[in-house]
Amino acid sequence: EEELQMIQPEKLLLVTVGKTATLHCTVTSLLPVGPVLWFRGVGPGRELIYNQKEGHFPRVTTVSDLTKRNNMDFSIRISSITPADVGTYYCVKFRKGSPENVEFKSGPGTEMALGAKPS
């Protein structure tokens, strides 16, 4: 089996207030089975941004159709950016577990920061 890697190509993403930000994440393998989640920050206080399998995230859309059985693109778009959205975003692969899924591998993270306002 090819070892799964989480690829977040941008280390830094400069965004503009009010605009939409695209955070890229691709995986190199579909295995082990389990969901991909997005978080802002690390550790126990990290904020869940998007959960592939459940939840309501009105400002978040996926770039690809995650219902494709061979989908490896878990990039997301966050609309209506505000200063409160700055931080480092991680896409994280979980493997299935009982009763809870188990964190398997994290991407290196993408820092979202505010860029200069357009003149």
Epitope: P32, T67, N70
Partner: antibody, heavy 118, light 107 residues
């Protein structure tokens, strides 16, 4: 309430074609992958085909590849199964099912009976 | 292929366990589907190994480990008589499969 209602079943002769429909309501149809599953008389469940939410990707069991085509019309909240070159072995109740995020099934239709007989 | 026993029986109130083997824990998610009569609509009682839909009684539970999944009915009732199908999705092949079904008889 999620509701899936199949239609289009009936009696056909070997070699003929049939198109099944599944009308979906009670959920955002365009957000879910869908599948067709059948059950021959006295037999178990058999998955036939699946389709992604957007309709661009389709998946089939080997035994129906080339004969059956799954498709969907999201504005009409409808799923279809076009079946051709039917044989007696295709006689079954055909169910449409909504997929979970990991391609299992959470809701099923009541089924429509297809009988292939000369 | 997924393998499950052809039949199990129990008295009301007992705990029933139905096993399903043949999948790979690394690549397979399991579900359990209840069919009360042939040709009637199946009902999903467990999906994603151990997730119970909100309208399914709490006496139904599921687990998976290694190459097997288990459906557990704690305090079985007469109305639980049905055929239970184990289902799997294999992320390696993109294919759904079913076991042959287990007939549960409540004595």
């Amino acid at each position: 309430d999620v509701q899936l209602v199949e239609s289009g079943g009936g009696v056909v002769r070997p070699g003929e074609s049939l198109r099944l429909s599944c009308a979906a309501s009670g959920f955002t149809f365009s957000s879910y992958a869908m599948s067709w599953v059948r059950q021959a008389p006295g037999k178990g469940l058999e998955w036939l085909a699946g389709i992604s939410a957007g309709g661009s990707d389709t998946y089939y069991i080997d035994s129906v590849k080339g004969r059956f085509t799954i498709s969907r019309d999201n504005p009409k909240n409808s799923l279809y199964l076009q079946m051709s070159s039917l044989t007696a072995e295709d006689t079954a109740v055909y169910y449409c099912a909504r997929e979970t995020w990991n391609h299992l099934f959470d809701y099923w239709g009541l089924g429509t009976l297809v009988t292939v007989s000369s | 292929a997924l393998t499950q026993p052809a039949s199990v029986s129990a008295n009301p109130g007992e705990t029933v366990k139905i096993t399903c083997s043949g999948g790979d824990y690394y690549s397979t998610y399991y579900a359990w589907y209840q069919q009360k009569s042939p040709g009637s609509a199946p009902v999903t009682v467990i999906h994603s190994d151990d997730k119970r839909p909100s309208d399914i009684p709490s006496r139904f539970s599921g687990s998976a480990s290694g190459s097997a999944a288990t459906l557990i009915i704690t305090g079985v009732r007469v109305e639980d008589e049905a055929v239970y199908y184990c289902g799997g999705y294999d992320g390696r092949t993109y294919i759904n499969t079913f076991g042959a079904g287990t007939t549960l008889t409540v004595l």
